[in-house]
């Protein structure tokens, strides 16, 4: 008789997760010598322990504390660059400027970035049918909670000047409800952070308006301001040019008005 | 908080020189991208010259309309960047704004600078 299971709001756990993370961990680890060191198999049995067997909303920060420990990193902490709803171009941006890191760039977000999963109370079963939604079943899920862990330490680590790059194509360029929003702005550092600098990115080809005067980037200036951060804020207009621009600036079609 | 003071602005003949100086404070500014543009009247802002951080090679980079006659450098002891405007032309007259970027200064259609300084007038006659 098939047991009955927990029917989720959200799609369940990425095919072939463990498989997955283990792979990325091996492909990880030989790629950035700093972390050779690293012991794939413990990676993937601290991220298992975070989450099988545990009822699926009832997952805390303490879970992943092992996970952690083991995915414990150093990155420069002034070439920080995070993103809100603008992720596939942070991530082009630090294939250019090598120097600069975004979460996803680290161990630890590079083992969990766009993978789902979630487990089992009392089952060591991985539950490959669904996995709960953060808005529609509830929010200290596995996939949340891991990135509640992972964004917040990247923050705290974070110093002098920080960058996040904002979806100027959004109704809301700033979300108080994102990770961004709700868990990163609020672990910066302020004995660190001398600066958050936000770079807004437009989508329209003729948007020359300039989105750094949004009432939502004046509410962003007016949380990090109250923490005692400076704010300063830059319009991206044309994100594809200025990417090659960062590549090249003596290029000629980067110094001639359009 | 980051400053730019530009200065060395001025009226001169078609064909003679000036040259600009832009002294940042605030910050260390050797890593940065520092530079010109410019507003001539009725007209938008424009890129002029810019000069990559040390970390890039302190690289020059110029608009066509001011190539092989503006030269722009940098005295990274002083956290100064400076114009050199040889064989003005009339075209040039605008107001000139020193600007400064951790990562690149580019076109303004392209990005906005990081930060901007106050200007200083330059006049050219015939």
């Known amino acids: 008789v098939p047991r009955w299971r927990q029917q989720w709001s959200g799609p369940g756990t990425t095919k072939r997760f463990p498989e997955t993370v283990l792979a990325r961990c091996v492909k990880y680890t030989e790629i950035h010598p700093e972390m050779r060191h690293v012991d794939c198999q413990s990676v993937w049995d601290a991220f298992k322990g975070a989450f099988i067997s545990k009822h699926p909303c009832n997952i805390t920060e303490e879970d992943y504390q092992p996970l952690m420990k083991l995915g414990t990193q150093t990155v420069p902490c002034n070439k920080i660059l995070l993103w809100s709803r603008i992720k596939d171009l942070a991530h082009q941006f630090t294939q250019v400027q090598r120097d600069m890191f975004t979460l996803e760039d680290t161990l630890l977000g590079y083992l969990a970035d766009d993978l789902t999963w979630c487990g089992e109370f009392n089952t060591s079963k991985i539950n490959y049918q669904s996995c709960p939604d953060w808005r529609k079943d509830c929010s200290n899920n596995p996939v949340s909670v891991f990135w509640k862990t992972v964004s917040r330490r990247f923050a705290e680590a974070a110093c002098d000047v920080v960058h996040v790059m904002l979806n100027g194509s959004r109704s809301k360029i700033f979300d108080k409800n994102s990770t961004f929003g709700s868990v990163e702005v609020h672990n910066l550092q302020p004995e660190k952070v001398q600066t958050l600098e936000a770079w807004v990115i437009h989508g329209g080809r003729e948007d020359s308006r300039d989105l750094c005067q949004d009432p939502t980037i004046k509410e962003l200036e007016s949380i990090i301001s109250k923490r005692n951060i400076q704010f300063s804020c830059k319009n991206i207009y044309r994100p594809d040019k200025f990417l090659q621009c960062v590549k090249n600036p003596e290029d000629s079609s980067c110094t001639s008005e359009i | 908080d980051v400053q730019l003071q530009a200065s060395g602005g001025g009226s001169v003949q078609e064909g003679e020189s000036l040259k600009l100086s832009c002294v940042g404070s605030?910050?260390?500014?050797?890593?940065?991208?520092m530079g010109w543009y410019r507003q001539a009247p009725g007209k938008d802002r424009e890129f002029v010259a810019a000069v990559s951080g040390a970390g890039r090679g302190g690289k020059p980079s110029y608009a066509n309309s001011v190539k092989g006659r503006f030269t722009v450098s940098r005295d990274n002891a002083k956290n100064t960047v400076y114009l050199q405007m040889d064989n003005l032309k009339p075209e040039d007259t605008a107001v000139y704004y020193c600007?400064?970027?951790?990562?690149?200064?580019?076109?303004?259609?392209?990005?906005?600078?990081?930060?901007w300084g106050q200007g200083t007038r330059v006049t050219v006659s015939s």
């Open positions: 600007a400064a970027d951790r990562l690149v200064l580019v076109a303004l259609s392209i990005a906005d600078p990081g930060f």
């Open positions: 605030g910050r260390t500014f050797s890593d940065w991208a």
